[in-house]
């Protein structure tokens, strides 16, 4: 059974997560951003289920397009660099969701914007860390 | 069950305009793309422009000056028209649905001829 | 725009024999990839989305692999209904482009 401690632990990386996610939804959305029309383009796989941690798989999976289309985004609207960016959030990933078990992720026909993908993910975090509290 | 069907003139004079009708059943305008592509006789597969859930598009550069798609959600129907018809655009029009799975209509032929 | 080479263009090949068909795009893709299998006549069927995911009612003998630029289409035993064109389409930039297609015959 997880302890209160690991439980915190948890706590903290989501809201880790849910912060990042948020910033770069809101760099992306930014009125000054010129290139939301040309990364509205791209289509990101979202998760059939998204409701415990080990669904994150269907995140991690989705990292390095996600790389790809913030690198379109002038940086300034972030405060790091996508690469960083997005290495931070894989390494938050990797220890929510854990190497024990191999997980296959299974993936909706629907496919979302870059600004869809964002806000799933954020209310995954929202959802999760609602149940810890 | 998912069904794209289009249907289409059969034969435009050159010069002429080309307009194509794609209904589709089974899910909602809303939720997703469609594209169109198209296939010359005995040729490869073209792919034209798309139309995004929110209407917005994105053609083809080849097409960008001809080319306009349309949609009416409450219709369940995307339209394609193109413009300046010559006897090179002679091919089966197909819409698509996109998606991680692609669902494809059959086709409509059009033959571009005097 | 992001190219997509199809290879080979035709091939022949004798009942039983492993058939293998190379797409590589111009950059990376993300698996985003489908492989389409088309006989004269009919529209093109879809037999493999997401670079690897075999779709419901294509034969096992069919599978899809690769990452980054280059995915491969295999079919591990030809078997006669299996003479047709195939051809690859990314997904991932628009224009949403195709392979210029594989003819596949029988020895």
């Known amino acids: 059974a997880p302890t209160s401690s690991s439980t915190k632990k948890t706590q903290l990386q989501l809201e880790h997560l849910l912060l990042d996610l948020q910033m770069i939804l809101n760099g992306i959305n930014n009125y000054k951003n010129p290139k939301l029309t040309r990364m509205l383009t791209f289509k990101f796989y979202m998760p059939k289920k998204a409701t415990e941690l080990k669904h994150l798989q269907c995140l991690e999976e989705e990292l390095k397009p996600l790389e790809e289309v913030l690198n379109l985004a002038q940086s300034k609207n972030f405060h790091l660099r996508p690469r960083d960016l997005i290495s931070n959030i894989n390494v938050i990933v990797l220890e929510l969701k854990g190497s024990e078990t191999t997980f296959m992720c299974e993936y909706a026909d629907e496919t979302a914007t870059i600004v869809e993908f964002l806000n799933r993910w954020i209310t995954f975090c929202q959802s999760i860390i609602s149940t810890l509290t | 069950e998912v069904q794209l069907q289009e249907s289409g003139p059969g034969l435009v004079a050159p010069s002429q305009s080309l307009s194509i009708t794609c209904t589709v059943s089974g899910f909602s305008l809303t939720n997703y793309d469609i594209s169109w592509i198209r296939q010359p006789p005995g040729k490869g597969l073209e792919w034209l422009g798309v139309?995004?859930?929110?209407?917005?598009?994105n053609y083809n550069s080849g097409f960008m000056s001809r080319l306009s798609i349309t949609k009416d959600n409450s219709k369940s129907q995307v339209f394609l028209k193109m413009n300046s018809l010559q006897t090179d655009d002679t091919a089966i029009y197909y819409c698509?649905?996109?998606?991680?799975?692609?669902?494809w209509g059959n086709g409509t032929l059009v033959t571009v001829s005097a | 725009d992001i190219q997509v080479t199809q290879s080979p263009s035709s091939l022949s090949v004798s009942l039983g024999d492993r058939v293998t068909i190379t797409c590589k795009a111009s950059?990376?893709?993300?698996?985003?990839l489908a492989w389409y299998q088309q006989k004269p006549g009919n529209a093109p069927r879809l037999l493999i989305s997401?670079?690897?995911s075999l779709e419901t009612g294509v034969p096992s003998r069919f599978s899809g692999s690769g990452s980054g630029k280059d995915y491969t289409l295999t079919i591990t035993s030809l078997q006669t209904e299996d003479v047709a064109t195939y051809y690859c389409q990314q997904f991932w930039g628009t224009p949403y482009t195709f392979g210029g297609g594989t003819k596949l015959e029988i020895k």
């Open positions: 997401g670079a690897t």
């Open positions: 698509v649905r996109q998606g991680r799975t692609p669902y």
């Open positions: 139309i995004w859930t929110g209407g917005g598009t």
């Open positions: 950059k990376d893709i993300y698996n985003r």
